[in-house]
């Protein structure tokens, strides 16, 4: 057959769907690979062809669009399952072609099972709510396009294994779940089950997301450097190891990049000749406030090194701060036998 632009297996689009539920899967060609949409392609005389390779098989085969009740169908650039079966798992390919043009891409589809607590191998999206921030909502995700607006589905919300009813601060409101005042106790997995009729049949869509309650922007502050500080002096003799921790607290800020770095005499450690290593550790509070510690280490410090300026810097979306460490050379202790004896007038 003639050459075809093969975009390979698009593993970035690892699509997971629940068994026995409808699934609508758009051909990724138009979303990620080509500069035109399906309508343009169709009006230019291009045809979209679907085929698949079953799990643990090498053989590409056409998709059977003649199953009872049109269980699998294609509509424009969407492949529909109404509903999926476990053995629909495999690699699916959509190919756009005419006599002179051909482009195709494959993607993996995994049909997964869930239990009655909605546990499954499905990768869950995370929705962050601000702690004690007033009313916030989550919306049942990825249900657009499954039924027309004239259809009024039923929506049932669950937290973990439990149907949400009579919860103190969590109220189901159709496709939305409202948190009157989010608390740490609201952390967990939330599931919406959307049930709707279509052509005399009834379908369920199950969507689970993880809610994580995080620090509120109302309480956010610029980075706080706990160490170095004015109370600790790093007093070393030449040849000793110099260890200076820079410990910085960052309030949680959505989409903020938290940065910590050292400068030595105003330069980044990479830009100077001394043998310095920096180790970083990060810890998080329950509300995702972050504490970063960068330990600056010089194995065998010289008297020159002890005269340098060591400054810890920190930056977040809330601002930038810096703090110099107090480093000095240790004054040698007096030698007892000679100096003290002289003091007593010994000859």
């Amino acid at each position: 057959s003639e050459r075809c632009d093969d975009w390979g297996l698009d593993t970035m689009r690892q699509i997971q769907v629940f068994e026995d539920e409808p699934a609508r899967i758009k051909c990724p060609l138009f979303e990620h690979f080509l500069k035109f949409n399906y309508s343009t392609a169709h009006s230019a005389g291009l045809t979209l062809i679907w085929y698949w390779t079953r799990q643990d098989r090498d053989l590409e085969e056409p998709i059977n669009f003649r199953l009872p009740e049109n269980r699998i169908s294609k509509e424009k650039d969407v492949l529909w399952f109404r509903p999926t079966l476990l053995n629909d798992t495999g690699n699916y390919t959509c190919m756009l072609r005419n006599t002179t043009y051909c482009s195709k891409v494959a993607f993996p589809l995994e049909v997964v099972q869930k239990d009655s607590c909605f546990n499954s191998p499905m990768k869950l999206p995370v929705h962050k709510l601000y702690i004690e921030y007033g009313i916030q909502r989550i919306t049942c995700p990825n249900v657009d396009g499954y039924f027309p607006s004239s259809v009024k589905p039923t929506i049932t919300w669950y937290m973990g294994c439990y149907k949400i009813q009579n919860f103190n601060n969590v109220i189901p409101e159709g496709m939305n779940l409202s948190f009157l005042i989010a608390l740490i106790s609201n952390n967990g997995n939330y599931t919406c089950v959307v049930t709707y009729p279509e052509n005399g049949r009834t379908f369920h869509l199950t969507r689970t997301l993880t809610v994580k309650v995080v620090g509120s922007p109302k309480n956010a502050v610029p980075p706080v450097i706990h160490s170095p500080n004015d109370h600790v002096v790093y007093e070393k003799e030449p040849g000793e190891e110099l260890l200076i921790p820079c410990t910085v607290y960052f309030s949680f800020l959505m989409d903020s990049r938290n940065e910590v770095w050292w400068t030595i005499d105003g330069k980044k450690p990479d830009d100077i000749t001394i043998d310095v290593t920096i180790n970083e550790s990060i810890s998080h509070s329950r509300t995702e406030d972050e504490t970063r510690t960068q330990i600056l280490s010089i194995k065998k410090v010289t008297s020159e090194d002890l005269k340098r300026s060591y400054v810890c810097h920190a930056r977040s979306a809330k601002g930038e701060v810096a703090k110099a460490a107090k480093v000095k050379q240790k004054v040698p202790a007096p030698r007892y036998t000679v100096e003290l004896a002289c003091g007593f007038g010994a000859t």
Partner: antibody
Framework: EVQLVQSGAEVKKPGSSVKVSCKAS????????IHWVRQAPGQGLEWMGY????????EYNQKFTDRVTITADKSTSTAYMELSSLRSEDTAVYYC??????????WGQGTLVTVSS | AIQMTQSPSSLSASVGDRVTITCKAS??????VSWFQQKPGKSPKLLIY???NRYTGVPSRFSGSGSATDFTLTISSLQPEDFATYHC?????????FGGGTKVEIK
């Protein structure tokens, strides 16, 4: 094909207990909740409670809280409803029903429990 | 517990008649009402869920409407196989509760 097959009719003495079983087939047992509903002769339906087979958690109608126990055995795909301290007004047909997303779509055939001295 | 009051408790009708059964909840239950059909000696069968959605395979002559506290089941043209008892139930909050049932008999 989804099926819920219940145990046979029982005649019990007042004060005794009854345990009704509901064997599920045609689907993954621990993907759905099982509810129990009863119907006294010539009366309406009365919800007794449910069991979540994954967590083992059961929720009961307070009217029965001290007398009813709903359990599930995942290894045999069977749900159970045990009612103790039986009285004559417990004479009813007991149904198990599979629920998902608030839909009671599949029901067992019912088990008649007669309480008589 | 939420009370579900169903009326009438029984009615007589002929094939082809339009039949309406109502159910009143003692509290707001949103759209969380289901309707079931039950024939003598048989288990209930789901007809309507979410107040107005027909379950799989249910004929279009059955329709449901209402929200909050007032709900209606309508059979637009009664068929011989429709003579049965109909139950409404609120699936909104535990304990789930049902109406007393409406028996539809042949006139």
């Amino acid at each position: 094909e989804v099926q819920l097959v219940q145990s046979g009719a029982e005649v019990k003495k007042p004060g005794s207990s009854v345990k009704v079983s509901c064997k599920a087939s045609g689907y993954t047992f621990n993907s759905y909740w099982i509810h129990w509903v009863r119907q006294a002769p010539g009366q309406g339906l009365e919800w007794m409670g449910y069991n979540n087979p994954t967590s083992g958690y059961s929720e009961y109608n307070q009217k029965f809280t001290d007398r009813v126990t709903i359990t599930a055995d995942k290894s045999t795909s069977t749900a159970y409803m045990e009612l103790s301290s039986l009285r004559s007004e417990d004479t009813a047909v007991y149904y198990c029903a599979r629920e998902y997303g608030d839909l009671f779509a599949y029901w067992g055939q019912g088990t008649l429990v007669t309480v008589s001295s | 517990a939420i009370q579900m009051t169903q009326s009438p408790s029984s009615l007589s009708a002929s094939v082809g008649d339009r039949v309406t059964i109502t159910c009143k909840a003692s509290e707001n239950v949103g759209y969380s009402v289901s309707w079931f059909q039950q024939k003598p000696g048989k288990s209930p069968k789901l007809l309507i869920y979410g107040a107005s959605n027909r379950y799989t395979g249910v004929p279009s002559r059955f329709s449901g409407s209402g929200s909050a506290t007032d709900f209606t089941l309508t059979i637009s043209s009664l068929q011989p196989e429709d003579f049965a008892t109909y139950h409404c139930g609120q699936i909104y909050i535990y304990p789930y509760t049902f109406g007393g049932g409406t028996k539809v008999e042949i006139k």
